[in-house]
């Protein structure tokens, strides 16, 4: 799902207030609900009829440093016999997410939000058009 | 996939530098890759064998203000005949994402990161346990 443009209003102070100096804002340390955890059913990536693999990307100047991307294993879907059925399609499910980018020059450290597209998993769909009969 | 704990290091200055004043950091205005957009196959939520609906939650003091949650429509999966097959299970795919929480007292505005669990869609899996024969 998509994140709308900031529209330069969310991060602004009310009009009656002096503007933010130097184009930056105050970001409080700590993360709300930091201990909240994804709870997904076990091994769904291999049990799915549209199975996927995970690839981890790592960047020490990004929070979270680890971003996991899914890739669908098949073009078709896996049928009850464990064979690929190309009359159905495995398709990725994508999500826009925010990460924080760290920028430093000596002791001057600043942060900036960055939008990242993450493929979270795959789902099996009936095709819109049949390339293959 | 899960976001690891901050571990109080990512947002800190190097040890040789003076500490961050008042427990806050500088967040630059603007979002890197703001124009990047999800490109997903059309209507996958209704074409999936594990279809889902979307619910929108709205909070003006959160960025993005709109967070979309998916809910699987069925317990089983939809077969080639368009009927629900309860020998297979529709399960949610979750993702941890970051949002920004805005806090203001008069002209003093600060921001804080918040972790949110988002259900992005659903996938059809072979069951771990057979509740139903």
């Amino acid at each position: 799902r998509k994140i709308p443009k900031v529209g330069h209003t969310f991060f602004q102070k009310p009009e009656s207030c002096p503007p933010v100096p130097g184009g930056s804002m105050k970001l409080d340390i700590g993360i709300i609900n930091e201990n909240q955890r994804v709870s997904m059913s076990r091994n769904i990536e291999s049990r799915s009829t549209s199975p996927w693999n995970y690839t981890v990307t790592w960047d020490p100047n990004r929070y979270p440093s680890e971003v996991v991307q899914a890739q669908c294993r098949n073009l078709g879907c896996i049928n009850a016999q464990g064979k690929e059925d190309i009359s159905m399609n495995s398709v990725p499910i994508q999500q826009e997410t925010l990460v924080v980018r760290r920028k430093h020059q000596g002791c001057s450290v600043s942060f900036q939000l960055e939008k990242v597209l993450v493929t979270v998993g795959c789902t099996c769909v009936t095709p819109v058009i049949h390339h293959v009969q | 996939r899960k976001i690891p704990k901050v571990g109080h290091t990512f947002f800190q200055k190097p040890e040789s530098c003076p500490p961050v004043p008042g427990g806050s950091m500088k967040l630059d205005i603007g979002i890197i890759n703001e124009n990047q957009r999800v490109s997903m196959s059309r209507n996958i939520e209704s074409r999936s064998t594990s279809p889902w609906n979307y619910t929108v939650t709205w909070d003006p003091n959160r960025y993005p203000s709109e967070v979309v949650q998916a809910q699987c429509r069925n317990l089983g999966c939809i077969n080639a005949q368009g009927k629900e097959d309860i020998s297979m299970n529709s399960v949610p795919i979750q993702q941890e994402t970051l949002v920004v929480r805005r806090k203001h007292q008069g002209c003093s505005v600060s921001f804080q990161l918040e972790k949110v669990l988002v259900t992005v869609g659903c996938t059809c899996v072979t069951p771990v346990i057979h509740h139903v024969q």
């Epitope: 709870s39 997904m40 059913s41 769904i44 | 609906n53 619910t55 939650t57 949650q69 998916a70 809910q71 699987c72 429509r73 069925n74 317990l75 089983g76 629900e84 309860i86 299970n89 529709s90 399960v91 949610p92 979750q94 669990l117 988002v118 259900t119 899996v125 069951p127 771990v128 346990i129 509740h131 139903v132």
Partner: nanobody, 123 residues
Amino acid sequence: QVQLVESGGGLVQAGGSLNLSCVISRRTPSGYAMGWFRQASGKEREFVAAISWIGGGAVYADSVKGRFTMSRDNAKNTVYLQMNSLKPEDTAVYYCNDMPYGLDTTMDDYDYWGQGTLVTVSS
């Protein structure tokens, strides 16, 4: 913490009926299914029935199929279990719970249960 309140249990003769209800205080945004479970004295808790909040489709354990009917009222965050043709072996404490992974949910996935409602079927 989500709260679950089950009610409607009681003592009934074999062949009789009862209608259980369960109110969930707060549905998670992604929560899509609810289940009924039961635990007879000295036995493990077992699955009875499940329903999808959106689709409304219900599934049943073989032992209750054709006798029990699960339904839901989305506006009231309530699910029901209509139990007909009750048998002595249906005697148990009945619990409801959110099923975060639908039919993929296992007993290990729960860390919280309500107080349940006792159903006793006499012969």
